[in-house]
Amino acid sequence: VPRWRQQWSGSGTTSRFPETVLARCVKYTEVHPEMRHVDCQSVWDAFKGAFISKYPCNITEEDYQPLVKLGTQTVPCNKTLLWSRIKDLAHQFTQVQRDMFTLEDMLLGYLADDLTWCGEFNTFEINYQSCPDWRKDCSNNPVSVFWKTVSRRFAETACGVVHVMLNGSRSKIFDKNSTFGSVEVHNLQPEKVQALEAWVIHGGREDSRDLCQDPTIKELESIISKRNIRFFCKNIYRPDKFLQCVKNPEDSSCLSGIHHHHHH
């Protein structure tokens, strides 16, 4: 007799989730010698332990602590890149600028990037049919709590000048409800972080507005300043050119610095 299964509004666990986490862990520890000591089987066991057999609307940050402990990693000062609503460009940037790191360049972020997962109360099964949706079902679901947990930790450990890439094409360039706005901003440590530098990425080729004057950026500046962290903002008018210049800084068209405008 098939057992009754809770139907959630979100898509189910990503196909071959356990194998993907394990394979990603092996690959990551291969190319990051500082994480070579990590036992990927233990990482998977800790990941699994955070959500298996638990009601998927009652997951806590505490559930992920064993995993967080295993994945402890530090980023050098001035090398943290946060992002909001512009993941692809942020990742393209760190693929070129290899000494800067987004959360998804760290082990735990890399393991979970673009994946969905959840279990069921009192069974050892993974639910491949459906998982809770943040809006329609609950916010304390395995995926949302994971990202909140690791984002908090990522922000807490940042130091020096922290950079954030923001999407200038959105109606809210800075969104207080995003992970950046609700978690990371509030967990930067003023005693370790001297400044937050926002890079506002323009969408249109002919867009020459100073988006650093946007009301939501002013709101971000206010929040950051109140936390005794200095704030800077730059317009990135041509993201394609910006990436090209990161790849080839010696290019004559890059030396003039025309691809962004600086605002304090």
Epitope: E19, L22, A23, V26, E30, P33, R36
Partner: antibody, heavy 121, light 107 residues
């Protein structure tokens, strides 16, 4: 018992490409790390790159970047190594090998029998 | 990348004698070192991993030692089937690198 069986010897012209296959039998192919290592006549071993079939997204040694393409087909449990713009110095035996399944250290416990690629005009 | 240097290039030993092969890393590789044996026309065969652990089916006459930058493979009493080329490989820092090999030949 896991085995890696490679395709046969190839003779190629300079400037052309070669594609060597490596078929795995036994075990869970998707989670192996399949690696390619080459050995020029009378020379030592040289690591070229590796792939985890489930993920795709191979890693390459700097020396071969841009010239080598490593792929894997999970449906046939076969990994491939394609080397382009061949020159005489690429004449070598090409081996596929794997790490201990699936999350052991990065030494090679199982090897294919090797494929001799001769580049000659 | 880490450079692995093996010495000597060739070692001439009589059957029954002891052979000592050396492998030096250009920087510390901890104990993340493997040894392989290769006979003519064959693929390499794993002998030792973790600097000192024998792989499955490898006779007790093969032993490995060392850590950091200096490693040794010892064959306590050479048998006729042991005459071959031996390679060390570090798997501490990506990309993985091999030594250039030591040929053990009959004296």
């Amino acid at each position: 018992q896991v085995q890696l069986v490679q395709s046969g010897a190839e003779v190629k012209k300079p400037g052309s490409s070669v594609k060597v296959s490596c078929k795995a039998s036994g075990g869970v192919f998707s989670l192996y790390t399949i690696t390619w290592v080459r050995q020029a006549p009378g020379q030592g071993l040289e690591w070229m790159g590796s792939i985890i079939p489930l993920l795709g997204d191979p890693e390459y040694a700097q020396k071969f970047q841009g010239r080598v393409t490593i792929t894997a087909d999970e449906s046939t449990s076969t990994a491939y190594m394609e080397l382009s713009s061949l020159r005489s110095e690429d004449t070598a035996v090409y081996y596929c090998a794997r790490y201990p399944y699936p999350y052991g250290s990065k030494y090679f416990d199982i090897w294919g029998q090797g494929t001799l690629v001769t580049v000659s005009s | 990348e880490i450079v692995m240097t093996q010495s000597p290039a060739t070692l001439s030993v009589s059957p029954g004698e002891r052979a000592t092969l050396s492998c030096r890393a250009s920087q510390s590789v901890s104990s993340n070192l493997a040894w392989y044996q290769q006979k003519p026309g064959q693929a390499p065969r794993l002998l030792i991993y973790g600097a000192s652990t024998r792989a499955t089916g490898i006779p007790a006459r093969f032993s490995g030692s060392g850590s950091g930058t200096e490693f040794t493979l010892t064959i306590s009493s050479l048998q006729s089937e042991d005459f071959a080329v031996y390679y060390c490989q570090q798997y501490n820092n990506w990309p993985w690198t091999f030594g250039q090999g030591t040929k053990v030949e009959i004296k």
